[in-house]
Amino acid sequence: SEVEYRAEVGQNAYLPCFYTPAAPGNLVPVCWGKGACPVFECGNVVLRTDERDVNYWTSRYWLNGDFRKGDVSLTIENVTLADSGIYCCRIQIPGIMNDEKFNLKLVIKPAKVTPAPTRQRDFTAAFPRMLTTRGHGPAETQTLGSLPDINLTQISTLANELRDSRLANDLRDSGATIRIG
């Protein structure tokens, strides 16, 4: 079952995904796609990184964190109801069937009608356990467990405040991390 995240229409949605590079600058290609992770690659790719940089992206989809440190969390700008659905974060670790796949379900709620200068947004997330990745063949593909639900409240939806907030660190500390090497 997919990990679920929520955002309101008009806000920015945040879908966390992390890995720990084996060495600084030793990056692993990552792709984000709309739809559950298929067997290979990502379907309906919205953003892709390679060993050096973001090499493909579409409008409204961007990486807000420091992807060079393994923060490949996806931000979707100014969401609409049509953005609801499952998203795939795929960490493309070299080797046979080594990729780590995460399906994240985004639920978009209609905007609250009561105007307010700042609105609260709730994130409810069950994060995958930390995993030290080792080579494994097709018959040994692993299913990741999940930690108990964690409730986080994000006070602001401004992108730069999100970048500077402790949310990314909180998520990383909670174990939503793949360690490479």
Epitope: G35, A36, N44, I86, P138, T141
Partner: antibody
């Protein structure tokens, strides 16, 4: 226009070998996974093998593991399937297909018949 | 492996009528499902991917639906060129697997 043209099929005795080729054109070959899919007479489609863009990952259906080898040459825009220790049950039409997890372009196929 | 079961094996339909083909997966494949058309002597042709997205050049009379384990291909008004064998294929789980096919024949 995307084109995939297979060749190399034919009649071979059980235990024999064949090498199938697929010439690709009309797209950036080096950007796509590629697959071989087969269809035995009167049967359905069966995925056989695929290969990553750079050749670093190759996957096979269990029934051909250890006997078939998929490879590619991006300089020649070509895909290959080396088939050894052929069995009667390998008799089929073999298709080369561009692989996006689903198969969006197919060749016309090349017939492999394994019989004594 | 994920076993894909198609039904019926043969569907007899008159031109102009609606055809509904079913595909069932032995385990969830999310929406990672494709449909193909195969005519004798021709290469298979991709019709639908991601369960409901029509491939380039595919007429609007072809539509796909479903997610998880139950999927449907609908041909709203059969044309003479639509009589063929149709296959579903899942790409959610390794290995990639096809259904056994449904033959749509003229009634």
């Amino acid at each position: 226009e995307v084109q995939l043209v297979e060749s190399g099929g034919g009649l071979v005795q059980p235990g024999g070998s064949l090498r199938l080729s697929c010439a690709a054109s009309g797209f950036t070959f080096s950007s796509y996974w590629m697959s071989w899919v087969r269809q035995a007479p009167g049967k359905g489609l069966e995925w056989v093998a695929n290969i990553k863009q750079d050749g670093s990952e190759k996957y096979y259906v269990d029934s051909v593991k250890g006997r078939f080898t998929i490879s590619r040459d991006s300089a020649k825009n070509s895909l290959y399937l080396q088939m050894n220790s052929l069995r009667a049950e390998d008799t089929a039409m073999y298709f080369c297909a561009r692989d996006s997890n689903f198969f969006d372009y197919w060749g016309q196929g090349t017939l492999v018949t394994v019989s004594s | 492996e994920t076993v894909m079961t198609q039904s019926p094996a043969t569907l007899s339909v008159s031109p102009g009528e609606r055809a509904t083909l079913s595909c069932r997966a032995s385990q969830s494949v999310s929406s990672n499902l494709a449909w193909y058309q195969r005519k004798p002597g021709q290469a298979p042709r991709l019709l639908i991917y991601f369960s409901s997205t029509r491939a380039t050049g595919i007429p609007a009379r072809f539509s796909g639906s479903g997610s998880g384990t139950e999927f449907t291909l609908t041909i709203s008004s059969l044309q003479s060129e639509d009589f063929a064998v149709y296959y579903c294929q899942q790409y959610n789980n390794w290995p990639l697997t096809f259904g056994g096919g449904t033959k749509v024949e003229i009634k």
